[in-house]
């Protein structure tokens, strides 16, 4: 099967603060076809949240989720 | 680990098109962004594309649009790229790499377009 | 589209110097800029991240910083096994580029 029928998901602000680590389920890079760079998080509450790439934070949270996967 | 595996060589007729593989192993696939790179001696890395493979979606090098397809198959978490209407100047070594950071790269493919 | 320039093109070294190689952006890449070093005939492997991010597994030689449209790759003492290209790439916006390259060979 070709790539699953997904919209398009991008990030036009991040988030200002950072999510405590055991709020996130699972991570995934915004879409090539979005102007700006992003991580959305996706949260236990089935939340969406864009996050910076380039923070640290972010890449430990998506690190330790890539570990545990 | 995670690891994009591509073969190692390709060699196409001019006029012919080729469709290469990366496959991506150790991670989850529709998390991260496959990247397209050409290299050739005389210039350097040159950004051919991207795809999503949570979607589909693609963004390409202008200079690129018309050369490269770019798609993704989740079922066997495969990137592929195909090039057409090859000819000398598509010669080149052909990268997959995985994410914004480039983290994992793939062994790279030699194209050589000669009759 | 962001034109990357690295400088020098060469850079002859003798093991154990200090180094800076250069990588200027024209127009601001933020703190998406990333460093990576091409031995012959492998492919090319991430150094640095985000402008100065250490990345695992690196030797702790190599650090980059910089910011805006300015930035530096250093390596605090060369080592033979570090000879070979070093390019620099911007994901800021669409296209990512990359840098023409630093070479860096033995003096």
């Known amino acids: 099967s070709l790539a699953a029928d997904t919209p398009t998901a991008c990030c036009f602000s991040y988030t200002s603060r950072q999510i405590p680590q055991n709020f996130i389920a699972d991570y995934f890079e915004t879409s090539s076809q979005c102007s700006k760079p992003g991580v959305i998080f996706l949260t236990k509450r089935s939340r969406q949240v864009c996050a910076d790439p380039s923070e640290e934070w972010v890449q430990k949270y998506v690190s330790d989720l890539e570990l545990s996967a | 680990q995670v690891q994009l595996q591509q073969p190692g060589a390709e060699l196409v007729k001019p006029g012919a098109s080729v469709k290469m593989s990366c496959k991506a192993s150790?991670?989850?696939?529709?998390?991260?962004?496959i990247h397209w790179v050409k290299q050739t001696p005389g210039q350097g890395l040159e950004w051919i594309g991207a795809v999503s493979p949570r979607n589909g979606d693609t963004s390409y090098n202008q200079r690129f649009k018309g050369k490269a397809t770019l798609t993704a198959d989740i079922s066997s978490s495969t990137a592929y790229m195909q090039l057409s209407s090859l000819t000398s100047e598509d010669s080149a070594v052909y990268y997959c790499?995985?994410?914004?950071?480039?983290?994992?790269w793939g062994q790279g493919t030699t194209l050589t377009v000669s009759s | 589209d962001v034109v990357l320039t690295q400088s020098p093109a060469t850079l002859s070294v003798t093991p154990g110097d200090r180094v800076s190689l250069s990588c200027r952006a024209s127009q601001s890449v933020s703190k998406y800029l990333h460093w990576y070093q091409q031995k012959s005939h492998e492919s090319p492997r991430l150094l640095i991240k985000?402008?100065?991010q250490s990345i695992s597994g690196i030797p702790s030689r190599f650090s980059g910083s910089g910011s805006g449209t300015d930035f530096t790759l250093s390596i605090n003492s060369v080592e033979t096994e570090d000879l070979g290209m070093y390019f620099c790439q911007q994901s800021n916006s669409w296209p990512h580029t990359f840098g023409a390259g630093t070479k860096l060979e033995l003096k």
């Open positions: 150790g991670y989850t696939f529709t998390s991260y962004n």
């Open positions: 985000y402008v100065s």
């Open positions: 790499a995985r994410g914004y950071g480039y983290d994992y």
